[in-house]
């Protein structure tokens, strides 16, 4: 009597998540009487997948009619495959007994599941950084299989090179995750810039997934301040202008101080946007020179996006002839500024 053979013709089968997988198995003889069972994995911890003798396995069906006694095909079909179904499946013949006695196992068929990566999620720094600083962006994508995957970073269409990428876990798994960090040097022109994380995988058929982040969420462009005096008017009033330029985001509070005392506070709102995404704002203060016996020290104090205030001061000389246009005026700088501005009429 020839020895019973359990034949699993495919060493491996690859299936897309959501599809059905067919695992083939035939036996060379139906003797001795006893069940065929399918297991995932080998050894004592193996998992019963299908028992042709009995049981309820809603996702598994026999490919051939199991009621035909002369049928030697014990192939099964598993529906709605998920990455969790990956593994090596064994078709095993038992001899009827108490307990059933394992007679022979097939060589096994490795089922690999092709699962698409999730849409990449890009996250930027928790706090804004100023131009000329480097910030980190992270990109994450999960649930893909097989492990091979390509991730690229772009800033305004140009590939970034300061990138660190990890795929986890390092060993065999039903599915994998990728996490990548890109370091991006900010410039003042980056308000409209965008970083893109692009993920390519065999399941995507050449159409990579992209996740984006706007640098506008990560950048702070501090303002330039310029204080100037306009011509003195006939009614002894001096018009002093504070020009706040090239800042982002719009959140900005401006306070005028006269000789250290708060004169007026304003909040920026509904400002028109510059081409580069930054904002400008101009504030005027009318000073009645005749009401002052001494020189008036005017300070334009700007608090931008919760940062420490920046001041620009300007002295109005009361002794000057009212009709003169500030030729005897002088400006004074205090605080941290992008550039120095000296007073005088423009």
């Amino acid at each position: 009597e020839e020895e019973l053979q359990v034949i699993q013709p495919e060493k491996s089968v690859s299936v897309a998540a959501g599809d059905s997988a067919t695992l083939n198995c035939t036996v060379s003889s139906l003797i001795p009487v006893g069940p065929i069972q399918w297991f995932r994995g080998a050894g004592p911890g193996r998992e019963l997948i299908y028992n042709l003798k009995e049981g309820h396995f809603p996702r598994v069906t026999a490919v051939s009619d199991p009621t035909k006694r002369n049928n030697m095909d014990f192939s099964i079909r598993i529906s709605n495959i998920t990455p969790a179904d990956a593994g090596t499946y064994y078709c095993v013949k038992f001899r009827k007994g108490s307990p059933d006695v394992e007679l022979k196992s097939g060589a096994g068929t490795e089922l690999s599941v092709r699962a698409k990566p999730s849409a990449p999620v890009v996250s930027g720094p928790a706090v804004r950084a100023t131009a000329e600083h480097t910030v980190s962006f992270t990109c994450e994508s999960h649930g893909f299989s097989p492990r091979d995957i390509t991730l690229k970073w772009f800033k305004n269409g140009n590939e970034l090179s300061d990138v660190q990428t990890n795929v986890d876990p390092a060993g065999k798994s039903v599915s994998y995750s990728i996490r990548s960090t890109a370091r991006v040097l900010l410039t003042r022109r980056d308000v409209h810039s965008q970083v893109i994380c692009e993920v390519a995988h065999v399941t995507l058929q050449g159409d990579p997934l992209r996740g984006t982040a706007n640098l506008s969420e990560a950048i702070r462009v501090p303002p330039f301040l310029e204080v100037t005096q306009q011509s003195m008017r006939a009614d002894n009033q001096v018009n002093v202008t504070c020009q706040v330029t090239k800042f982002y985001p719009q959140r900005l509070q401006l306070t005028w101080l006269e000789n250290g005392n708060v004169s007026r506070t304003e909040m920026a709102s509904a400002l028109p946007e510059n081409k580069d995404g930054t904002y400008n704002w101009t504030s005027w203060l009318l000073v009645n020179v005749s009401a002052h016996r001494d020189d008036v020290k005017l300070t334009c104090q700007v608090e931008h996006d919760g940062q420490p205030a920046v001041n620009k001061s300007f002295s109005v000389k009361v002794s000057a002839h009212p009709k003169e246009q500030g030729s005897n005026t002088a400006a004074e700088n205090t605080g941290t500024n992008e550039r120095n501005i000296y007073g005088g009429s423009g």
Epitope: I31, V33, L52, K53, E54, T67, R69, K96, G97, S98
Partner: antibody
Framework: EVQLVESGGGLVQPGGSLRLSCAAS????????MHWVRQAPGKGLEWVSA???????YYTGSVKGRFTISRENAKNSLYLQMNSLRAGDTAVYYC????????????WGQGTMVTVSS | DIQMTQSPSSLSASVGDRVTITCRAS??????AAWFQQKPGKAPKSLIY???SLHSGVPSKFSGSGSGTDFTLTISSLQPEDFATYYC?????????FGQGTKLEIK
């Protein structure tokens, strides 16, 4: 339709012989383990004999050496040759098909009566 | 040989009742237990195999359970046609053996 029809029963004297036949239709008899089961009048069921797909044969202790099970594939038929019959062999004899994976009985014939009496 | 002991040997019940018949094997038989129904003058009919699987065409009011040595047949709601004799059987090893039968009668 899957069917089993027994024949060959009757009255026989102790020590005599009888050959029971079981004609199968609707399936190939040689692909299944086949059995004979008997039931003495007013008693329960008793398994008698079986023949496997490889031609291997099995008997209950009380009939060993006296009964022989066989099949004829060309006629799709099962047989039970009964020799040295005793009064205790009096029963209705049923031909039964063993089921798909594990030989669970699934199809029964209507039975044929064997009476051993002088 | 493996002995199959059925209980009770007879049982009176009414239409609509739920009844349970038990069978104990003298040694472990895995789940290779079967149940049969026989009416007077008729051949037995196969109801259940591998302890709990219903043969094709058998109504779901019949159910079986058990593994090892103890097995039960339950009929959920008795109908007039269910009054008959029921047999259990082990078919794990030769010689296959039957229980002595349980006669289910109308009360």
């Amino acid at each position: 339709e899957v069917q089993l029809v027994e024949s060959g029963g009757g009255l026989v004297q102790p020590g005599g012989s009888l050959r029971l036949s079981c004609a199968a239709s609707g399936f190939t008899l040689s692909s299944y383990d086949m059995h004979w089961v008997r039931q003495a009048p007013g008693k329960g069921l008793e398994w008698v004999s079986a023949i496997g797909t490889a031609g291997d044969t099995y008997y209950t202790g009380s009939v060993k050496g006296r009964f022989t099970i066989s099949r004829e594939n060309a006629k799709n038929s099962l047989y039970l040759q009964m020799n040295s019959l005793r009064a205790g062999d009096t029963a209705v004899y049923y031909c039964v098909r063993g089921g798909v994976w594990d030989d669970a009985f699934d199809i029964w014939g209507q039975g044929t009566m064997v009476t051993v009496s002088s | 040989d493996i002995q199959m002991t059925q209980s009770p040997s007879s049982l009176s019940a009414s239409v609509g009742d739920r009844v349970t018949i038990t069978c104990r094997a003298s040694q472990g038989i895995n789940n290779y237990a079967a149940w049969f129904q026989q009416k007077p003058g008729k051949a037995p009919k196969s109801l259940i195999y591998t302890a709990s699987s219903l043969h094709s065409g058998v109504p779901s009011k019949f159910s079986g359970s058990g593994s090892g040595t103890d097995f039960t047949l339950t009929i959920s709601s008795l109908q007039p046609e269910d009054f008959a004799t029921y047999y259990c059987q082990q078919y794990v090893s030769y010689p296959y053996t039957f229980g002595q039968g349980t006669k289910l009668e109308i009360k």
